[in-house]
Amino acid sequence: IPVIEPSVPELVVKPGATVTLRCVGNGSVEWDGPPSPHWTLYSDGSSSILSTNNATFQNTGTYRCTEPGDPLGGSAAIHLYVKDPARPWNVLAQEVVVFEDQDALLPCLLTDPVLEAGVSLVRVRGRPLMRHTNYSFSPWHGFTIHRAKFIQSQDYQCSALMGGRKVMSISIRLKVQKVIPGPPALTLVPAELVRIRGEAAQIVCSASSVDVNFDVFLQHNNTKLAIPQQSDFHNNRYQKVLTLNLDQVDFQHAGNYSCVASNVQGKHSTSMFFRVVESAYLNLSSEQNLIQEVTVGEGLNLKVMVEAYPGLQGFNWTYLGPFSDHQPEPKLANATTKDTYRHTFTLSLPRLKPSEAGRYSFLARNPGGWRALTFELTLRYPPEVSVIWTFINGSGTLLCAASGYPQPNVTWLQCSGHTDRCDEAQVLQVWDDPYPEVLSQEPFHKVTVQSLLTVETLEHNQTYECRAHNSVGSGSWAFIPISAGAHTHPPDEFLFTP
């Protein structure tokens, strides 16, 4: 650790005196202290002499000697008082900047230690300190306002009693800054904007922070816009607002707008897109297929996405038939707004009944005209089967009618014994009918097909079964010949229960 001569913690001299401070270390040494006039420094190897032959009150302060090569970073210090009867204070700063809840050191250094008993801190023009101002004094360093608050940002003076009268220092401005948690908060409204050429538009960029020191600007396609700024303070926050008003928009106003705000903590930005169009527009679309197939008894939601400007003047769902003149219940129609110009309209169709198959149309209207989007809803049914015995062209024929959607496939089985349903062990013969005759096939209705099985002679101890299946399910009908005549037998359990 370096050693200072004179080896005293503090030295008191009169103005005009010669002061010589010598520092000696093992290696080279350096002096540091408050920037002040008249000092001369002489260095000679491991010693350094700081001297003045005309000390003034401005030289009052703590001078520290360090040894840069010392790994322990040791230092020695001496405090110099230059006691000027006319100048009790040496003020080392015009301004002190601290953050809230930090201690604020106001560097009024007392030039004469004897005056310590009569010192006080006041606000300029003799005003008392604000209530709850907690402060302490050190003749070497000055007044410390503990845990400074934003409201204590004031101009202060240090006061000393000299010969019964108070002598004030020059003033020190204290700036207590709010602790800034991060970059300013931003809002840019609207989030998206569409206008027809010639209409008016407004874009508002605003930023707020607990501290007034922040910048905000609005830029269009990377060009900073010159917009007058409005400032405000409310809810303990500073607000800066930029409002872009366009009386008659044109295509060059379209593009990306960014609101950017920055402070010492960093930068925030948010963007929006402004579209300028030639005329009103109304676009309907759906992510769903417009042709829907749903099993009877199940539910379906039909969704339409609408993009429109200006806003919709009317919209509704309509059932276009073919089964009845019923209309969708309004409570089943639902609208959600994704954003200003995009909406989703949903029609809920729970537990679909046969009479609800058909065309559903969503209609919407704005100044651009009417638009419609139509869904075609076909219901799927499992097959229903019936078998009769008849003669066609003199031949005995089993006639199987199967009705369902999608179109059922038909398979005939012949099995031994009398049974409601042939199982594998009993099957004697199987015939697939790849091309049954289509009896009816109207849109939104079941498809009815007919399959013929010509049987020369009915075997009386056997069963003939017609099976039909499609993607929804299957159905069957067993035909049991009996001596008194044919006997038909549907299965015990009816497979279709809507």
Epitope: W31, S36, P37, H38, N54, R64, L92, A93, V96
Partner: antibody
Framework: QVQLQESGPGLVKPSETLSLTCTVS????????WSWIRQPAGKGLEWIGR???????NNNPSLKSRVTMSVDTSKNQFSLKLSSVTAADTAVYYC??????????WGQGTLVTVSS | QSVLTQPPSASGTPGQRVTLSCSGS????????VNWYQQLPGTAPKLLIY???QRPSGVPDRFSGSKSGTSASLAISGLLSEDEADYYC???????????FGGGTKLTVL
């Protein structure tokens, strides 16, 4: 050995605020005085102001009240803000340690241009 | 307009001795010590002389400073081409409560 590095935007628009930061490495920022000095192209040096680690500042009166300095001992940094800039503030800005009444060492400097 | 006055330019040939001057007033050089800074092309200023005549470690003894009244001078002997630079004088200014600089002298080694 102490090293200083200035950082900040190289271009500032007229009437806006110039903001620079000086990062100190090789020693603690504490217990020293730190200064800002500037040099317009082809001209001499001008002392802007100094800050002590307690937050005490002194400014060159020629810059009036446009100068704000602050210090962040946790980051070993001090900063300069110069408000309402004009083209006359275009210069290379240096940070330096102030020792009694001289400057040593200096940062390498950063050019700030004031232009729209 | 700088507070301290320096000639804008000076020149010398290699090996020659050149002296750069700096004049001020009683508010600066007259009552305070003078410091000199060297600024090589494209670099930051570097402390060359402090307290009128003290050289920081690493500065060759070819450089020497002196002060008389309200003027100061920097002498460079045995001039080298690497000495080609701008040289600035500086001193504490009492009313400013800070340091003032000269306008700088551009030294050319011919």
């Amino acid at each position: 050995q102490v090293q200083l590095q200035e950082s900040g935007p190289g271009l500032v628009k007229p009437s806006e605020t110039l903001s620079l930061t000086c990062t100190v490495s090789g020693d603690s920022i504490s217990n020293y005085y730190w200064s800002w000095i500037r040099q317009p192209a082809g001209k001499g040096l001008e002392w802007i102001g100094r800050i002590y680690t307690s937050g005490s500042t002194n400014n060159n009166p020629s810059l009036k009240s446009r100068v704000t300095m602050s210090v962040d001992t946790s980051k070993n940094q001090f900063s300069l803000k110069l408000s309402s800039v004009t083209a006359a503030d275009t210069a290379v800005y240096y940070c330096a340690r102030e020792r009694i009444n001289w400057f040593d060492p200096w940062g390498q400097g950063t050019l700030v241009t004031v232009s729209s | 307009q700088s507070v301290l006055t320096q000639p804008p330019s000076a020149s010398g040939t290699p090996g020659q001795r050149v002296t750069l001057s700096c004049s001020g007033s009683s508010s600066n050089i007259g009552s305070n010590t003078v410091n000199w800074y060297q600024q090589l092309p494209g670099t930051a200023p570097k402390l060359l002389i402090y307290s009128n005549n003290q050289r920081p470690s690493g500065v060759p003894d070819r450089f020497s400073g002196s002060k008389s009244g309200t003027s100061a001078s920097l002498a460079i002997s045995g001039l080298l081409s690497e000495d080609e630079a701008d040289y600035y004088c500086a001193a504490w200014h009492d009313s400013l409560n800070g340091v003032v600089f000269g306008g700088g002298t551009k030294l050319t080694v011919l």
